[in-house]
Interface confidence: low
């Protein structure tokens, strides 16, 4: 009698009576292990059981045959009891395994069913018999297969109009985008329900079975809330009777997880930041919906908060460390800031940001807000779980590390405070750091806030100086008139707190304001009318564009330039600060060298390469090589003596200067000094990816041009200042090398 | 994936020394600062000592301070617990963890690779 044979598309070994084929499916195909067993059985045969070596290699290649590498598929291995271990659901014994290391475990004690890795170790996994799978079926040598099975028409559950999935009593949404947790939370409550409850095994395996087979996100927020005392709550109400922790879970993570999702591979539930964002499940009742109603809008009602707290946007704000005593590491100021009923700070906006910016002056510390990154690297969080959706990084910031020593990463972020032209922006500094901190509570519709204090004449006291916005459009010259009839100037912003200030008392007017930065008076350099130097900016991105014009603060708190005879709100100062006189021409000498010459001009000396051209980042280190930096022009003055002494090179190259633009879209000059004069030929800045700034030998003037260009370039540093006969010498910072007093100084300008 | 396997461990009298080790395989060891925790029949795991990945930096336990010592030989991938003047309040299954997060170094939740243990006895 021939030999029994295979059905075709059956792959067999000579060594066993046995036949595979593999069912390697798509998503929306794929089946549990129990709809896979049952789908063999109706051919005839039995979900795949592997005996020997032999069977194995069959099976592998059968895989590599159909390039179904990696995938999974279903054994017929089956749990039956502690004493029995694993069985083949054909009935026959376990007597060859290849499980794989650490397996089978069990995980989270519902792993009951086995399934086969299709790569070269063909090694198997126990996992929960729900999960969605290829899977491989085995049938006898010699016996035809039995038609497969029609596929039971998806018993889906059915669906609403809006999209909800229909189960029992309730109706479910699935999110395919990813939200923070309030963001979900209000989308569910706009649509008359909230984040899921689950109440039950049952529920939660139709939900996770739902995700698995629809195209499922990692993760789901579901409607538990975990309080700072670590208790559980469902937000509808419910009671919690029934929890399913992965393993491991609730961890509790930086003491700020107080969200919890779904994981969608296996329906077990992590704990997490609820300001991360994720998919999300909402529920409503079959008997909630009614389209004719609108959710009711909370009215607005007035609250305030305790004494020493300030009051903005419905929250109360207290900065603590003025006294040195107060000052706290990070996680002691978040358990003192909880302590108050609140968190540290989290900040939603740049309004938010200027009201902290402007309580803060004074302030010689920089403040801890709820910001970090501790749980996972460079995903910054707010503590309190709010969505990041507003950032306010400091330059070169986040940083990341602080030291090479694992304890001493950069996890936790302040807002820089002192008399920095960086006050008000965030840097990642390390938590254990003793910094002030900012606490944040809901306001008290029981209080009520005081009134601003406000002069009789109308203006308001910050600092040292005293401020009017008045409402009335005028030209700008109309606008430093008026200011001086009140007995005030037209008002100068030299810090980042003031800035925050002018910015917030904008607040309900909705309308431009002239500030006293002005270049039409003074040769195109952008100088205070009253006299103070320019050691702040505050520029919004490409500008100052125009170059001899007057300084509006717009409604975004940026200033931006424009014709002085158009009309803006302005806004008046009064103080009895004396402004600092410019300080004396700096007396010094340029260092002498064989190799490059320097040229003397006030206080600094510059040297002018026009042989080699480099690119801009390539000139920049040139110069930071000699112990300067590519150029920043800061006047008039400083560009006309350039100009004179490039304007015979002009047959050979341009010239980089040290302007650039940076990712924000402002211009900067590379040694940090505040963009107080500007000289841009017609039409430029221009042009998207033309980041760096070029001087015309022809004319002086400049165009932004791409930084790869190569050019010549221009290098300033302070001069030198020799010792004084006692012997003790002054360096500047750009060079502390020491220079010999005794040689002859030929470069004195 | 990272394996810890500790040993060490034993019956002691009070005041008396034991030496831990802890031997990593897997990944980059030098990658993870590791720590020492202790679990106590029906006690709360508790934190006794953790060493940086350079091996420059350590931190202890206020009870364990001036009595254990953390070390670590990379080259080896060893982890080491000296522990001396040992008192029966310190018995309990000593683990070993590799820190994973940037979490406070006493934080249990910041390691995500941790040892079966070792059975420390101290008798009086």
């Known amino acids: 009698t021939p030999e029994p044979k295979c059905p075709e598309d059956w792959g067999a070994s000579s060594r066993t009576s046995l036949c595979f084929k593999l069912y390697a499916k798509g998503k929306h195909e794929k089946k549990t292990w129990f709809e896979s067993r049952d789908f063999c059985r109706a051919l005839g045969g039995d979900l795949a059981s592997i005996n020997n070596k032999e069977e194995q290699q069959t099976i592998w290649r059968l895989i590599t045959a159909s390039g179904s590498y990696h995938k999974l598929f279903w054994l017929g291995l089956t749990y039956g009891s502690p004493s029995e271990g694993f069985t083949w659901s054909d009935g026959s014994p376990v007597s060859y395994e290849n499980w794989a290391y650490g397996e089978p475990n069990n995980y989270q004690n519902v792993e009951y069913c086995g399934e086969l890795k299709g790569d070269p170790t063909m090694s198997w996994n126990d996992i929960n018999c729900e999960h969605l799978n290829n899977w491989i079926c085995q049938i006898q040598k010699g016996q035809t297969p039995k038609p497969e099975p029609t596929p039971a028409p998806q018993d889906n559950p059915p669906v609403t109009e809006d999209g909800w999935v229909i189960y029992k009593d309730y109706q479910y949404y699935f999110s395919k985008e990813k939200e923070t947790m309030d963001n979900a939370r209000a989308f569910c409550k706009r649509n008359f329900g909230d984040l899921v409850s689950i109440q039950s095994e049952s529920e939660k395996k139709f939900l996770w079975k739902y995700v698995n087979r629809n195209d499922a996100q990692s993760a789901y927020f579901i409607g538990l809330l975990i309080s700072l005392d670590k208790k559980f709550a469902w937000m509808d109400g419910s009671k919690v009777d029934y929890v399913s922790w992965a393993t491991g879970e609730p961890n509790f993570a930086n003491e700020d997880e107080n969200c919890v999702t779904m994981y969608s591979n296996s329906g077990f539930w992590n704990d997490i930041n609820c300001g991360y964002p994720n998919a999300f499940i909402c529920q409503r009742h079959n008997s909630s919906i009614n389209a004719t109603t609108v959710m009711p809008t909370m009215p607005s009602v007035p609250s305030g908060c305790k004494e020493g707290w300030n009051f903005y946007s419905n929250k109360c704000f207290k900065i603590f460390g003025f006294m040195e005593e107060e000052r706290k590491n990070w996680q002691e100021a978040r358990k003192a800031c909880i302590g108050f009923g609140g968190n540290l700070v989290s900040i939603q906006n740049e309004k938010e940001q200027a009201f902290l910016t402007y309580h803060m002056k004074d302030s010689t510390f920089s403040a801890w807000t709820g910001l970090n990154d501790v749980n996972s690297e460079h995903t910054f969080l707010w503590t309190d779980g709010r969505g990041v959706h507003y950032t306010n990084w400091g330059k070169g910031y986040p940083g990341g590390r602080r030291s090479s020593l694992s304890y001493e990463d950069a996890d936790c972020v302040v807002i820089i405070g002192g008399a920095s032209n960086e006050a008000g922006k965030w840097m990642d500094d390390t938590c254990d750091s003793k910094r002030g901190y900012i606490c944040q509570t809901r306001s008290d519709p029981s209080l009520t806030n005081p009134p601003a204090t406000i002069q009789t004449d109308g203006f308001v006291k910050y600092g040292k100086s005293s401020y009017s916005l008045m409402r009335q459009k005028f030209q700008w010259h109309e606008a430093e008139t008026y200011c001086k009839l009140h007995n005030s100037l037209i008002a100068s912003i030299l810090d980042p707190y003031s800035n925050a200030f002018a910015w917030l008392q904008m607040e309900t007017s909705n309308e431009r304001v002239w500030i006293a930065l002005n270049s039409n008076l003074t040769d195109n350099q952008y100088t205070w009318t009253d006299k103070w130097r320019v050691r702040y900016t505050n520029w919004a991105a490409d500008e100052p564009k125009l170059k001899s014009a007057c300084v509006y603060l717009d409604l975004d708190g940026y200033w931006k330039t424009a014709h002085c005879n158009e009309s803006f709100y302005f806004l008046c100062k009064r103080s009895d600060e004396i402004p600092a006189t410019e300080p004396p021409q700096l007396p010094g000498r340029c260092p002498e060298s064989d190799h490059t010459a320097w040229i003397p001009f006030h206080g600094h000396c510059y040297y002018i390469e026009s042989s080699y051209t480099r690119n801009w980042g390539q000139a920049s280190l040139e110069c930071l090589r000699m112990g300067s930096s590519l150029v920043s022009i800061e006047s008039a003055a400083e560009s006309s003596f350039l100009s004179y002494r490039v304007e015979p090179l002009k047959s050979k190259t341009n010239f980089w200067i040290g302007l650039f633009r940076n990712v924000e879209g402002t211009w900067l000059w590379i040694n940090n000094s505040p963009v107080s004069f500007v000289n841009w030929n017609t039409g430029d800045p221009s042009g998207e990816r033309n980041d760096c700034v070029a001087l015309h030998a022809s004319s002086g003037f400049w165009s932004n041009i791409h930084c790869s260009s190569y050019k010549g370039y221009i290098c300033k540093r302070p001069k030198i200042i020799d010792a004084k006969p006692t012997h003790e010498l002054l360096t500047t910072k750009a060079d502390t090398r020491k220079m010999d007093p005794s040689k002859p100084s030929s470069n004195v300008a | 994936q990272v394996q810890l396997q500790e040993s060490g461990g034993g019956l002691v009298q009070a005041g008396g020394s034991l030496r831990l080790s802890c031997a990593a395989s897997g990944r980059i060891f030098s990658a993870y600062a590791m720590g020492w925790f202790r679990q106590a029949p029906g006690k709360e795991r508790e934190f006794v000592a953790a060493i940086s990945r350079s091996g420059d930096s350590t931190d202890y336990a206020d009870s364990v301070k001036g009595r254990f010592t953390i070390s670590r030989d990379s080259a080896k991938n060893m982890v080491y617990l000296q522990m001396n003047s040992l008192k029966p309040e310190d018995t309990a299954l000593y683990h070993c963890?590799?820190?994973?997060?940037?979490?406070?170094?006493?934080?249990?939740w910041g390691y995500g690779y941790w040892g079966q243990g070792t059975q420390v006895t101290v008798s009086s």
């Open positions: 963890a590799a820190r994973t997060v940037s979490a406070p170094p006493s934080a249990a």
